[in-house]
Interface confidence: medium
Amino acid sequence: DVNECTSGQNPCHSSTHCLNNVGSYQCRCRPGWQPIPGSPNGPNNTVCEDVDECSSGQHQCDSSTVCFNTVGSYSCRCRPGWKPRHGIPNNQKDTVCEDMTFSTWTPPPGVHSQTLSRFFDKVQDLGR
């Protein structure tokens, strides 16, 4: 069985992984990539494209961050002038940031509701 994937004549498009099977091979999309419209996933003519999670809205970035598309994935970076909250690293999918100017701001006494806290955050945003 010739391993077509390592024979020096790589048969797959550069957007795919070559997977050797007995007597044949497959060209599968790389993780975080998807077949271009109309292209199947597997045959030697497979062509894939990097899923842009940011543009397509398939990301989980917090509103305090900006989504950045990376190859096969995405990351969430603090908005300019903001910093990661409580030692959470920047540039991760779960990054949450806070405004450096108002990092000590707290809701008025007695406000414990998550919804109200978010409301005050929005009011504070409007005041900027």
Epitope: H13, S14, S15, V47, C48, E49, D50, F68, T70, V71
Partner: antibody
Framework: DVKLVESGGGLVKLGGSLKFSCAAS????????MSWVRQTPEKRLELVAA????????YYPDTVKGRFTISRDNAKNTLYLQMSSLKSEDTALYYC????????????WGQGTTLTVSS | DIVMTQSHKFMSTSVGDRVSITCKAS??????VAWYQQKPGHSPKLLIY???TRHTGVPDRFTGSGSGTDFSLTISSVQSEDLTDYFC?????????FGGGTKLEIK
């Protein structure tokens, strides 16, 4: 046999304009992202413009933004680069290059066309 | 912008030798690195992509390795036609950027 043939190079005065063309054959041009990459006299390679498959999205680094315009005509299998307000630092060998996706390497390269900007 | 640094502008070698050309990225680029060979008077030619995948028709004496920020291109047994320029490139994020090049020359 894949071919990318650039044309339109020449000597231009400082502040002048020029348009390059790149004729493609031997591959499905309309399925490839295309770019212009220049090589300076010191041999440094620099991406100057990129365009997606249908021409609807383009990219320019800050060094050429507002001065260079990349476009393509898939019916004619041709890529273009319109350059204006040319500076001496634009002097280079310009290659047209094809890549299979936004973030994929340059698989196909032309032979290059030279731009010399003189004062 | 991501800066790709090829610390050796020139490397001396002999035919039959094993040689490694290195490239360092200023930030993590995963495995989104390609290597190109450029002979005098010719355009660059893709050798390696995804840091270690050989492009179609590239001889198996060329091997790429690395991930993150440190990458290398190794030629297991240098042939006379390999004595030329090599460039690394990252395609993790725009602007796509290249290293300054390494010229492989005879000792």
């Amino acid at each position: 046999d894949v071919k990318l043939v650039e044309s339109g190079g020449g000597l231009v005065k400082l502040g002048g304009s020029l348009k390059f063309s790149c004729a493609a054959s031997g591959f499905t041009f309309s399925s490839y992202y295309m770019s212009w990459v220049r090589q300076t006299p010191e041999k440094r390679l620099e991406l100057v413009a990129a365009i997606n498959i249908n021409g609807g999205s383009t990219y320019y680094p800050d060094t050429v933004k507002g001065r260079f315009t990349i476009s393509r005509d898939n019916a004619k299998n041709t890529l273009y680069l319109q350059m204006s307000s040319l500076k001496s630092e634009d002097t280079a060998l310009y290659y047209c290059a094809g890549h299979g996706g936004l973030r994929l390497p340059f698989e196909y390269w032309g032979q290059g066309t030279t731009l010399t900007v003189s004062s | 912008d991501i800066v790709m640094t090829q610390s050796h502008k020139f490397m001396s070698t002999s035919v039959g030798d094993r040689v490694s050309i290195t490239c360092k990225a200023s930030q993590n680029v995963g495995t989104s690195v390609a290597w190109y060979q450029q002979k005098p008077g010719h355009s660059p030619k893709l050798l390696i992509y995804w840091a270690s995948t050989r492009h179609t028709g590239v001889p198996d004496r060329f091997t790429g390795s690395g991930s993150g920020t440190d990458f290398s291109l190794t030629i297991s047994s240098v042939q006379s036609e390999d004595l030329t320029d090599y460039f690394c490139q990252q395609y993790s994020s725009y602007p796509l950027t290249f290293g300054g090049g390494t010229k492989l020359e005879i000792k």
